[in-house]
């Protein structure tokens, strides 16, 4: 946020940039939280735009019995590994086809024991305030589906009739990691010393980090004809004086007609 300064007062202004503002020769360059000619004003809204999507990663192990392990499978650039990866990915795409959050699989390691496949199942969902529930549900469905397929697709008489066969007991979920996004925490952090006064409100499922000085939200402070200004003790209304009235009160809702006051003074003299 920048405010340009012209004229003789500029040099004077340079030394007066407040709140960590820096002079660039023309104006005070204000840090994120401030604006104004001298960076003296606190912004009333902070952009904490959420990521478009939130991801989750499930670390799984399955045992494939329809492929005999060879040393070449340890080498990720080998023809054998590449082919195994392709078939395994295709098989998992079929297994998880009904899960909208499913993105794909990533094999981390193949080891002996038939073929023990250590891999990640990748999930992603559009950000909404309910993203945790959505991803939690998706991870549960992943567990159900992999358990089902590794129970059903098994070798019979040492032969597999499916694309891949599995050892029923070799299926394990090691770990589930969900990208954390906490708008309230982000809002508090970015508002720094004003953190107690900034809140998150949602509009069209998008979070907005705002102070009561931001109009149009349920927490917005109505200063009537006055101006809302944030200070370390919270939002305050700065009341204005017009040609005909003085305004006062916590929300500048008390107007006093100047003529009455002047009239009273005049009468006094």
């Amino acid at each position: 946020r920048t405010t340009t300064c012209f004229g003789d007062g500029c040099q004077n202004t340079a030394s007066r940039c407040k709140n960590g503002g820096t002079w660039d020769g023309l104006k005070c360059q204000c840090p994120n939280l401030y604006y104004g000619e001298l960076c003296e004003e606190v912004v009333s809204s902070i952009d904490i735009g959420p990521p478009e999507t939130i991801s989750a990663q499930m670390e799984l192990t399955v045992t494939v019995t329809s492929v005999k392990f060879t040393e070449e499978l340890k080498n990720h650039s080998s023809q054998e590994f590449q082919e195994f990866k392709q078939t395994f990915t295709e098989q998992m795409n079929i297994v998880y086809s009904g899960i909208p959050e499913y993105v794909g699989v990533n094999i981390t390691k193949l080891r002996l024991g038939s073929v023990v496949v250590e891999h990640d199942v990748l999930l992603r969902t559009k950000y909404t305030p309910e993203y945790k529930t959505v991803l939690d549900n998706a991870t549960e469905v992943v567990k159900e589906k992999i358990t089902k397929v590794t129970t059903q697709q098994i070798m019979i008489n040492d032969i597999c009739s499916d694309m891949m066969c599995f050892n029923t007991t070799g299926t394990q979920v090691q770990n589930i990691t969900v990208t954390q996004y906490d708008p309230e925490e982000d809002c508090r952090k970015m508002a720094k010393e004003y953190g107690d006064y900034f809140v998150v409100e949602y509009r069209d499922q998008k979070p907005y980090c705002i102070s009561p000085c931001e109009p149009g939200f349920s927490v917005s402070k109505n200063c009537n004809l006055g101006k809302c200004q944030m200070s370390l003790s919270g939002p305050q209304c700065l009341c204005v004086t017009t040609e005909t009235h003085w305004y006062s009160g916590e929300t500048c809702n008390q107007g006093t007609q100047k003529s009455l006051v002047y009239g009273h003074h005049h009468h006094h003299h």
């Epitope: 019995t65 329809s66 492929v67 005999k68 060879t70 070449e72 080998s78 023809q79 054998e80 082919e83 195994f84 392709q86 078939t87 295709e90 070798m155 040492d158 032969i159 597999c160 009739s161 499916d162 694309m163 891949m164 066969c165």
Partner: nanobody
Framework: DVQLQASGGGVVQPGGSLRLSCAAS????????MAWFRQAPGKEREVVAF????????YYADSVKGRFTISHDNSKNTLYLQMNSLRAEDTAVYYC?????????????????WGQGTMVTVSS
């Protein structure tokens, strides 16, 4: 990439014999799987037999056991299918398939490399 070239099909009388060949190229290892599948008109593709080129395993469909023999010549990188005592129900397009893995599955979807088909007709 792996290339497969099948040949040897033809018309034969019931009880007769035929030998199919499939030349493979593009492998980086000398240990892999090769198979013969067949597809009769209006039917799904089915396995006939498969072999591991290291000699570790062979498999035959019940319908051809004792009549067909699968083999592989490592020096020529060629797969063979010796078909004896042929029957009318053996009439189909025969395909060779391959995998760089040692596969133990008869599902065609697990086999990534395919040759073009060669037609076998058993008819009197």
């Amino acid at each position: 990439d792996v290339q497969l070239q099948a040949s040897g099909g033809g018309v034969v009388q019931p009880g007769g014999s035929l030998r199919l060949s499939c030349a493979a190229s593009g492998y980086t290892s000398n240990r892999y799987s090769m198979a013969w599948f067949r597809q009769a008109p209006g039917k799904e593709r089915e396995v006939v037999a498969f072999i591991w080129t290291d000699g570790g395993r062979t498999y035959y469909a019940d319908s051809v056991k004792g009549r067909f023999t699968i083999s592989h010549d490592n020096s020529k990188n060629t797969l063979y299918l010796q078909m004896n005592s042929l029957r009318a129900e053996d009439t189909a397009v025969y395909y060779c398939a391959a995998s760089s893995l040692l596969l133990q599955t008869i599902n065609p979807r697990a086999w990534p490399y395919w040759g073009q088909g060669t037609m076998v007709t058993v008819s009197s």
